[in-house]
């Protein structure tokens, strides 16, 4: 069964900077990745970035840079301009659309005890949906 993992990491050097890492474990080729926060895409979540493997990437504030790390994983850098960090308690969700499997989504957040530089373990709350 395909699986999506999500890691949320606070940057050690800049406490207001976070990175979301997502990956797809499974066969098939990825046709689109959507990253949202506050919940799954289309279910109360706000879209942060859309990444297409050939056509490029689109990101919206507070996303700073969306990148492909490998053919099946992406990273999204976030910049928190506020004094207090809303990202610390936020859920980030990644949805991978792949052929022929369909869409698979998973969410994760920064663990409450996270030290800067440490990432959440790759065991997110799974919201695995095959569309």
């Amino acid at each position: 069964t395909p699986e999506v993992w999500v890691q949320v990491q606070m940057e050690a050097t800049e406490l207001s900077s976070f990175t979301v890492h997502c990956g797809f474990l499974g066969p098939g080729s990825i046709s689109l990745v959507t990253v949202s926060w506050g919940g799954p895409d289309g279910a109360g979540g706000t879209k942060l970035a859309v990444l297409h493997p050939e056509l490029g990437t689109r990101q919206w504030a507070p996303a700073r840079q969306a990148r492909w790390e490998t053919q099946s994983s992406i990273s999204l850098a976030l910049e928190d301009s506020g004094a207090s960090s809303p990202f610390a308690n936020t859920t980030f969700c990644c949805k991978f659309a792949s052929f022929p499997e369909g869409s698979w989504e998973s969410c994760g957040s920064l663990p409450p005890s996270s030290d800067p530089g440490l990432s959440a373990p790759p065991t997110p709350v799974p919201i695995l949906r095959a569309d």
Epitope: K47, E54, L55, G56, W60, Q65
Partner: antibody, heavy 118, light 107 residues
Framework: EVKLVESGGGLVQPGGSLKLSCVAS????????MSWVRQTPEKRLELVAD????????YYSDTVKGRFTISRDNAKNTLYLQMSSLKSEDTAMYYC???????????WGQGTLVTVSA | DIQMTQSSSSFSVSLGDRVTITCKAS??????LAWYQQKPGNAPRLLIS???SLETGVPSRFSGSGSGKNYTLSITSLQTEDVGTYYC?????????FGGGTNLEIK
């Protein structure tokens, strides 16, 4: 035929405000991201702001963040750019432009000139 | 943001010349590059997208090439109507960014 018509430019003093409009026709407005691109007197092009088809997502360049607000009224097929705390470096020709999904700016308006000067 | 650099800001050329304009990105943009032509008093006009795809109505004397960080716009035989400023723009990663422009003028 796709048409984008900007209006609202003019001469304004530093610190002042201005609201630009762009009326779109010839396509289904509420299915496209829309953008404002400006061209400085030195002829440099800069993406100032863009907005998703529903208006739920926006982007602002660092040079205008916190001063400019992009919005849209899909019922009126109109894109807006509210500009406040204007600076002399905001002097430019402002174009309303439509990218084609993942493709670049296929359609541009004729532009509206904004001059910020005392 | 990805920086786009057009090394020549202007060229003085003769009619019939082959003209090559270059553009360099600060990182790989995977051939997601557009070229625009702008004539005085007009908005930019899209000529090429995806580094090589000519827009409808663009004369075949225009062509685009390149990959990775380096891209080229070529005009095989310069015509009077080709005079103007040419801009490159990456459309790989938002915010989309433009080069500084290369102005073509007749000698």
């Amino acid at each position: 035929e796709v048409k984008l018509v900007e209006s609202g430019g003019g001469l304004v003093q530093p610190g002042g405000s201005l609201k630009l409009s762009c009326v779109a026709s010839g396509f289904t407005f509420n299915t496209y991201i829309m953008s404002w691109v400006r061209q400085t007197p030195e002829k440099r092009l800069e993406l100032v702001a863009d907005i998703s088809n529903s208006g739920g997502n926006t982007y602002y360049s660092d040079t205008v963040k916190g001063r400019f607000t992009i919005s849209r009224d899909n019922a009126k097929n109109t894109l807006y750019l509210q500009m406040s705390s204007l600076k002399s470096e905001d002097t430019a020709m402002y174009y309303c432009a439509r990218p084609d999904n993942w493709d670049p700016f296929v359609y541009w308006g004729q532009g509206t000139l904004v001059t910020v000067s005392a | 943001d990805i920086q786009m650099t057009q090394s020549s800001s202007s060229f003085s050329v003769s009619l019939g010349d082959r003209v090559t304009i270059t553009c360099k990105a600060s990182e790989d943009i995977y051939a997601r590059l557009a070229w625009y032509q702008q004539k005085p008093g007009n908005a930019p006009r899209l000529l090429i997208s995806g580094a090589t795809s000519l827009e409808t109505g663009v004369p075949s004397r225009f062509s685009g090439s390149g990959s990775g960080k380096n891209y080229t716009l070529s005009i095989t035989s310069l015509q009077t109507e080709d005079v103007g400023t040419y801009y490159c723009q990456q459309h790989w990663s938002t915010p989309w960014t433009f080069g500084g422009g290369t102005n073509l003028e007749i000698k």
